[in-house]
Interface confidence: low
């Protein structure tokens, strides 16, 4: 189920998939839970070490048990990631911190009036994920007010500074404020070019562009359908990005399928989940169990409940079953995404539904006049 | 909401605004969405006008004047107003409403969490109210959601300064002493929300005041960790199955 | 009925300032980005600013930037464009312009004012 | 910036006739082009929006076709009322005009 509270002066020992520099526990904490294997995270403030190095560091952990053992350590934040935790899962995280530089490759500086309006230039900046404002009181007057738009390969901060009078801030993107507005064409028989960040498999396009919405540096993707004639990138989905924002050239090319990111979507961002069901298609992963159940749609809801599940197959095959239940195959991967996608298959493959943030899960712990 | 500041898409989503369709359309009080087919309001917004087919209900809005005959909109289903509410006093001034059709969650619609039933530890050090009540006594209703950042008060104190009325413990205060700052008429009915452990809980509804905003006149809010039981029963009565985010 | 009406246009000498308005009708004002766009005489058509729907983005052709300001007062449903250290190259007929639908940003113009003459002349 | 180059600058041309405007893009915008119409002393008209949308009211002779940095304009048969200047215009990185096709009677 959902877990949604906080352990102060703890910190989880061992477990770790991930690390980088968060501005506080919140963050880190949707860091978590949006990582494929992510379970646990720990948070260590600046106040809580010495050690420069590790200061703001958000540490993404995993455990087959789904807990670690907590030790004492003082000022740090240790958590549960919000996987399973419904309408709480959400990649738009609005605070601004002040008397923190968060880092990152500068790409633009400008003028501005207010930290609010930093933060608005970084939403409507399609390569911009986080900034940093001076304020009018910060000590060198030739940087007053500049608001430096930043990105960094992982989305995050490749350090945080404190530093008196600076104010930084993630963009609103992931909230659907964006002024930009998305491309929501799906382009049949085009390959987008310019520079690859991630390659994932996925049964179709609309995964793919999900996947390529969710992943920090994903601006459009090129998706090679199932018949694509070079056999090894079948199923192919890989992320770009490139200097300007859009494609620098797209080619015609069968049996591909380009798109682009609805991160800059206003109002409407898709869930961060897929659940569509995939008949006749088996998804390779690293085996987490196995069960007997009646039904696809109760191997899903498996895989959903068990939380380290992302993603099953369930198998139709005479020797698979017993009576009305069959094998449900439940999968993990490094990625989050099958490692093999083949087809032709007896039975149905799909993803757990553990990110969607439409569930119902109690997911909340924790003489006059009227008005 | 008087001496507030305008508030940003996506910012207050279980904030919903709960209209009045006659011969003309107004504003008449806030709600909170507290589930998919759920809304938490206070039961003096139904005060002459408990026919729930001139309701409307408004979710996932900035800006009252977006509103146009296009937009949509939720009809209430039931009005449960609490059995011990009355029209003469200010205890008890709590009420659900269950929607005719469950809404979907969004960045901009969403529900807040509530409170651990009878929760007194918790100490809340940063909460805000939020309306489109008047700015000021004799003021109007704002097009922008305002929001504005509040303290809580101990109810011994909120006490003192309202010699005349009795201040349950079922009802929590919020104000400053200089005044200033206050919820007001338009605002009854939504939300006081406190942020503790990065999380926002819904502790107060909008209820009572003497005047808005005024020296050592604090708002007064019911308390919903106080009826936690009532709205539980309610809302699981209704359909058999817990709709709102309850604690786990 | 939609309607966008353009005033403050004048003759005004180079280094000058001139501010444009442009009264909105007929529609919901503050939902939407307006723009505004200049015609040389005998010349084609040049996108000079835009301002989104709460005001708080602005954007600028390069040949006004740092010149010209674009506000917007959403309570009076109105555009504005403050041109200051005007040259005789500014001189045009200036449009407002919006669409009535469409993703902001992503917007044709189908709603346009009839214009207003600047006049750049010493 | 995006520039846009309209050809021809000057089209002449008779009633009935098949004309063809053409507009390159420096770099790709997708979809995002928009044409218009404008006649002596007033606003301009939008004609088709996303390359080849048609603007509500706008009489079917009129398409547009096109993606990426290549767009045409085509007017099946010419009619009285269509002699004007004709422009792009994209905005798939804020908004960029043609310098404009000028359509006369031949």
């Known amino acids: 189920g959902c877990l949604t509270q906080l352990y102060e002066n703890a910190f989880f020992r061992g477990g770790d998939v991930a690390s980088m520099y968060t501005p506080n526990a919140q963050y880190c904490q949707m860091r978590c839970t949006f990582h494929p294997r992510c379970l646990l995270f720990s948070f260590l403030p600046a106040s809580s070490i010495n050690d420069m190095e590790k200061r703001f560091g958000c540490f993404l952990k995993d455990s087959v048990t789904g807990t670690l053992p907590k030790v004492h350590r003082t000022g740090a934040v240790s958590g549960h990631s919000l996987k399973q935790c419904g309408h709480q899962i959400s990649a738009c995280h609005r605070d601004i911190y002040k008397g923190v530089d968060m880092r990152g490759v500068n790409f633009n500086v400008s003028k501005v009036s207010s930290v609010e309006e930093c933060q608005k230039r970084c939403t409507s900046n399609i390569r911009c994920q986080f900034f940093s404002y001076a304020t009018q009181t910060f000590h060198k007057a030739e940087y007053r007010n500049n608001c430096l738009l930043k990105y960094s390969p992982g989305g995050t901060p490749t350090a945080i500074k404190v530093l008196s009078n600076v104010e930084s801030g993630f963009s609103l993107k992931p909230c659907a404020l964006s002024e930009i507005g998305c491309h929501m064409n799906i382009f049949q028989h085009l390959a987008f070019s310019d520079v690859d960040v991630a390659r994932v498999l996925t049964p179709d396009a609309f995964v793919c562009r999900t996947i390529c919405t969710y992943h920090p540096n994903c601006l459009f993707f090129t998706f090679y359908t199932n018949v694509w004639k070079i056999e090894s990138q079948r199923n192919v989905c890989l992320l770009k990005t490139s200097e300007s924002g859009t494609p620098s050239s797209s080619t015609p090319q069968e049996n591909t399928i380009s798109g682009y990111s609805l991160l800059t979507c206003k109002r409407t961002l898709p869930e961060p989940c897929h659940s569509k069901i995939y008949p006749g298609v088996d998804f390779g992963g690293e085996e987490l169990n196995v069960t007997f159940v009646k039904g696809v749609n109760v191997c899903q809801e498996t895989c959903t409940k068990m939380i380290r599940c992302q993603f099953f197959t369930y198998s139709l095959l005479p020797e698979d079953c017993k009576e009305e239940k069959c094998k449900c195959f439940l999968r993990l991967s490094m990625d989050g995404s099958p490692t093999r996608i083949a087809y032709g298959t007896q039975g149905s493959s799909g993803y757990s539904l553990r990110l969607c943030n439409t569930g119902d899960n109690s997911v909340c712990t924790t003489k006059t006049s009227t008005r | 909401i008087v001496g507030g500041t305008n508030s940003s898409w996506g910012e207050w989503p279980w904030q919903v605004s709960l209209q009045v369709k006659l011969t003309a359309q107004r504003h008449l009080c806030g709600g909170s969405l507290i589930g998919h087919q759920w809304v938490l309001t206070a039961a003096h917004c139904f005060d002459g006008l408990p026919l729930q087919d001139v309701w409307r209900i408004y979710s996932g809005i900035l800006n009252l004047s977006d509103i146009t005959k296009d937009t949509p909109f939720s009809q209430i289903k039931e009005i449960i107003i609490h059995q011990n509410y009355k029209v003469s006093e200010g205890n008890h001034d709590i009420a659900l409403i269950k929607l005719q059709a469950p809404l979907n969650y969004t960045e901009f619609q969403k529900p807040i969490c509530l409170p651990s039933k009878g929760d007194t530890s918790t100490i809340y050090t940063n909460c805000w109210v939020t309306g489109w009540g008047f700015s000021k006594e004799k003021g109007e209703i704002q097009n922008i959601l305002q929001k504005v950042n509040i303290p809580l008060v101990t109810n011994e104190e909120c006490q003192k300064r309202y010699q005349d009325y009795k201040i349950t413990q079922r009802m929590v205060c919020a104000g400053y002493k200089e005044g200033g700052k206050d919820a007001c008429k338009g605002d009854s009915g939504g939300p006081l929300v406190c942020k503790h452990n990065g999380m926002w809980r819904l502790v107060g509804i909008t209820s009572w005041g003497e005047g808005c905003a005024r020296r050592e006149q604090p708002g007064v809010y019911t308390k919903v960790a106080e009826y936690m039981d009532w709205i539980l029963e309610k809302t699981q009565s209704s359909d058999g199955k817990a709709q709102m985010q309850s604690p786990a | 009925e939609v309607q966008l009406l353009e005033s403050g246009g004048g003759l005004v000498q180079p280094g000058g300032s001139l501010r444009l308005s442009c009264a909105a009708s007929?529609?919901?004002?503050?939902?939407?980005?307006m723009m505004w766009v200049r015609q040389a005489p005998g010349k084609g058509l040049e996108w000079v600013s835009g301002?989104?729907?709460?005001?708080?983005?602005?954007v600028y052709a390069d040949s006004v930037k740092g010149r010209f300001t674009i506000s917007r007062d959403n309570s009076k449903n109105t555009l504005y464009l403050q041109m200051n250290s005007l040259r005789a190259e500014d001189t045009a007929v200036y449009y407002c312009?919006?669409?009535?639908?469409?993703?902001?940003?992503?917007?044709?113009?189908?709603?346009w004012g009839q214009g207003t003459m600047v006049t750049v002349s010493s | 910036d995006i520039q846009m180059t309209q050809s021809p600058s000057t089209l002449s041309a008779s009633v009935g006739d098949r004309v063809t405007i053409t507009c390159r893009a420096s770099?790709?915008?997708?979809?995002?082009l928009a044409w218009y119409q404008q006649k002596p002393g007033k606003a301009p008209n939008l004609l088709i929006y996303?390359?080849?949308t048609l603007e509500s009211g706008v009489p079917s002779r009129f398409s547009g076709s096109g993606s990426g940095t290549e767009f045409t304009l085509t007017i099946s048969s010419l009619q009285p009322d269509d002699f004007a200047t004709y422009y792009c215009?994209?905005?798939?990185?804020?908004?960029?005009f043609g310098q404009g096709t000028k359509v006369e009677i031949k």
């Open positions: 312009a919006y669409r009535r639908t469409g993703v902001p940003r992503r917007d044709e113009f189908d709603i």
């Open positions: 007929g529609f919901t004002f503050s939902h939407y980005i």
């Open positions: 301002i989104y729907s709460s005001g708080g983005i602005t």
């Open positions: 770099q790709s915008i997708s979809s995002w």
């Open positions: 996303k390359a080849s």
């Open positions: 215009q994209q905005y798939n990185t804020y908004w960029t």
